[in-house]
């Protein structure tokens, strides 16, 4: 028949060369001479020249080695001819596969391969997974099977055996405990992989497995005691620094400190920061200390990481023993404004008041007062005993000096320390009213109508307060009421000037006596202008001339 | 001489709870991962928990998951099996186990636990 | 159920040779060489007697050997003595959180 199996052909074959594979022969050769050829790829294509076939006889040729990862199958024709180039029989199927040898070793896919993994861990956590490729076939034959092995291990701490590697898969794993980041940071594996599934041809690459950091190390203070001196009274006053080592992995937060006072600061007055760099807890002061109250504060921080533990760690505590130092403080006034009420224009030496400072320091130091600040110089004060007089008219009135009936004086108080402190006082002098200003009307300057004229209405006003202002009464005085007359309206604050009498044009004075509720009297002279006219007017018309 | 000795076993009712111990002596306890394994009577060998050397990972198996707690004080060179919730299966000599690579070795001698009403 | 297979029982008389199998998987016995045995007399705790395959501890007679083909491990016990009557037990490391996988046990029953 005109057919022929699928021919085997190992790949590397030695030869000789050209070496006879199998024979094409057609049965139509008992009645003709029969001349065979073959095309395809590997005979008349690219690659050609790989096989060829004799002519006359049909035998198929190998005219060199054959190289499987190449080419791995050769698909040809064969085809029979009589001598006069008749075909005599339909092209062939010719299926030339290429078999394998083991003639490639495994190659891994990376010189150096990385992973990772949480110091810790226990067997069976997986690491990474290194890959190795064989051009082999792994299919047919085991020679491109590859098999993994870890050769070596470096460091080998704590024992040689801390890795495993999956013979097929390539994944890498733990199989022993004790990965300890601070003790080996990093492992280096050296790794086989090799063909023909573990007995062939080895490859080596490298493995290098970093170890993670957990949080399983406690910061710890070094050292846990401490004696600190703070003066009395410093606000955000650095105290101590407090130092810890940790032996997890530098500013990561199972590095990174946190403080907590545990213990001894009842009144809030400490509060405990991390420095950002050196990890040190920066103990400062919330609020000032106070020596004569408190003068020793013992502290208990306690320091944790940023991120939680991974298993249960003692915690450790440090003692901060802090002293307060005593300082000169300033004497304080009593109460720091005083308020007081003192009547007006009161006699000079008069008493007004005693304003005095208390000094926070135990010793019995000796306080002398004197004014800071009497912007009208009304007032003395006794430097031992801090005894106000007034030295000067105080006047309610004065309303460059007082404001809202209130006098405001700054005093001193100084301690004999060394150095001498100030403190400050205010006080407050409340006037009280006394009824020591009258009356006055407002305009004092008129101008009137002889006929038919207009009523003056004048408003009055007084500097005291009520009871000693309206209601106000009016009289005229002098022979004023000759010509004029005053009447007060009903509400008491303004006084009606009207002209009763003609007057030639001219200038006279009238003589307006006004007291208040409290009968306080003030004499005024209202410049009084009469012109010659009727009704209203503003300003005295001109002669007239006629024309 | 490396030595685990388990105690804590005894009997209890179903839902109740017990804690077994095992104090280690003769090598670095501290280093190694611990296991417990519990084999009921006339049957097999069966892991039950690990934990790793520092005690920050363990593990457990799906039948007792929940309801045991194993941990480890490494100043006192012990390890410990919390069982709560505890059932008639889980009836066992319990057996404490270092873990060496692939292997568990040493073990202790086992205490008994006994779940019934 | 075990997630290694071993027969329940064998047995052989005195002097002779016996071997016990466990059969795992390619992700277990097939994948690492970390094959243990243990040896368990009636009333006594576990006792390790062969790892990784075939790794013997120091005190352990060399009448016990170990192999590994495939996804099956084997353990040998030649010149059965009276002393061997006990349950074997294998182990194979495994990936995962259950990484130490037992067999069932098998029963050596010295005739």
């Known amino acids: 028949d005109w057919v022929v199996a699928p021919i085997s052909v190992p790949e590397n074959g030695k030869g000789p060369f050209p070496q006879r594979l199998n024979q094409l022969k057609s049965n139509k050769d008992r009645d003709t001479k029969i001349f065979y050829s073959i095309t395809g790829p590997g005979a008349d294509s690219p690659p050609e020249g790989v096989f060829a076939v004799e002519k006359e006889t049909g035998w198929l040729l190998l005219n060199k080695p054959l190289d499987r990862e190449e080419i791995a199958k050769y698909e040809l024709f064969g085809h029979a001819v009589s001598e006069n180039g008749a075909s005599v029989e339909d092209p062939m199927n010719i299926s030339i596969i290429v078999t394998d040898q083991n003639d490639h070793k495994p190659k891994f896919t990376q010189d150096t391969f990385r992973g990772s993994v949480l110091e810790g861990v226990l067997p069976g956590t997986s690491v990474m997974q290194v890959t190795a490729t064989d051009e082999d076939d792994a299919i047919y034959t085991y020679n491109g099977v590859v098999a993994y092995s870890i050769h070596s291990q470096e460091p080998k701490d704590p024992h040689d055996l801390m890795f495993t590697i999956h013979r097929s898969t390539g994944t890498i794993s733990v199989i022993s405990s004790g990965l300890d980041r601070e003790k080996v940071p990093e492992y280096t594996l050296t790794i086989q992989a090799t063909d023909m599934d573990g007995d062939g041809s080895t490859t080596t690459a490298v493995a290098v497995v970093e170890i993670l950091d957990a949080n399983d190390n406690a910061p710890m203070f070094d050292p846990q005691k401490y004696e600190a001196h703070v003066p009395e009274n410093a606000v955000g006053h650095e105290v101590q620094r407090l130092t810890v080592t940790d032996l997890d992995a530098p500013n990561s937060p199972a590095w990174r400190a946190t403080y907590l006072i545990m213990g001894g600061d009842d009144g809030d007055h400490f509060t405990i920061t991390t420095h950002p760099e050196s990890n040190q807890g920066i103990l400062t002061t919330r609020k000032g200390l106070d020596f004569e109250a408190k003068n020793q504060h013992t502290l208990y921080v306690e320091v944790t990481n940023e991120a939680p533990f991974v298993l249960k760690l003692p915690t450790s505590t440090a003692t901060i023993v802090v002293h307060v130092e005593d300082v000169n403080e300033a004497p304080v006034f009593v109460p720091p404004s005083k308020v007081v009420e003192v009547q007006e224009g009161i006699p000079t030496g008069e008493p007004v008041c005693v304003y005095t400072a208390e000094d926070p320091d135990k010793e019995n130091q000796k306080i002398s007062y004197r004014i800071l600040r009497d912007p009208a110089g009304w007032l003395a004060m006794d430097p031992d005993s801090g005894q106000v007089t007034a030295v000067g008219t105080l006047d309610r009135e004065d309303e460059q000096f007082v404001r809202n009936n209130i006098y405001e004086v700054m005093v001193l108080a100084m301690d004999n320390g060394s150095p001498p402190t100030t403190g400050t006082g205010t006080l407050l002098l409340t006037l009280i009213d006394v009824n020591d200003h009258g009356p006055v009307p407002e305009p004092r300057q008129i101008t009137i109508c002889n006929q038919s004229p207009v009523r003056q209405v004048l408003n009055i006003t007084d500097k005291d307060l009520s009871p000693h202002t309206s209601p106000f009464q009016a009289q005229l005085t002098d022979d004023s009421d000759i010509y004029w007359t005053a009447e007060v309206n009903e509400e008491g604050d303004t006084v009606v000037l009207s002209l009763k009498k003609f007057l030639k044009q001219d200038t006279y004075d009238v003589h307006l006596s006004l007291s208040d509720h409290g009968n306080k009297e003030q004499l005024t002279v209202i410049r009084a202008t009469v012109c010659d006219c009727h009704g209203h007017v503003e300003t005295c018309p001109g002669p007239w001339k006629g024309g | 001489e490396v030595q685990l000795l388990e105690s804590g076993g005894g009997l209890v009712q179903p839902g109740g709870s017990l804690r077994l111990s095992c104090a280690a002596s003769?090598?670095?306890?501290?280093?190694?991962?611990m296991s417990w394994v519990r084999q009921a009577p006339g049957k097999g060998l069966e892991w039950v928990s690990a934990i790793s050397g520092s005690g920050g990972s363990t593990y457990y198996a799906d039948s007792v998951k929940g309801r045991f707690t194993i941990s480890r004080d490494n100043s006192k060179n012990t390890l410990y099996l919390q069982m709560n919730s505890l059932r008639a299966e889980d009836t066992a000599v319990y057996y404490c186990a270092t873990i060496a690579p692939g292997r568990f070795d040493p073990w202790g001698q086992g205490t008994m636990v006994t779940v019934s009403s | 159920q075990s997630a290694l297979t071993q027969p329940a029982s064998v047995s052989g008389p005195p002097g002779q040779s016996i071997t016990i199998s466990c059969t795992g998987t390619?992700?277990?016995?097939?994948?690492?060489?970390?094959v243990s045995w243990y040896q368990q007399h009636p009333g006594k705790a576990p006792k390790l007697i062969l790892s990784?395959?075939?790794k013997r501890p120091s005190g352990v007679s060399n009448r016990f050997s170990g192999s590994k083909s495939g996804n099956t491990a084997s353990l040998s016990i030649s010149g059965l003595q009276a002393e061997d009557e006990a349950d074997y037990y294998c182990t194979s490391y495994t990936m995962g959180s259950t990484f130490m996988l037992f067999g069932g046990g098998t029963k050596l029953t010295v005739l």
């Open positions: 003769g090598f670095t306890f501290s280093s190694y991962a």
């Open positions: 990784e395959v075939n």
């Open positions: 390619s992700n277990d016995v097939g994948a690492y060489n970390y």
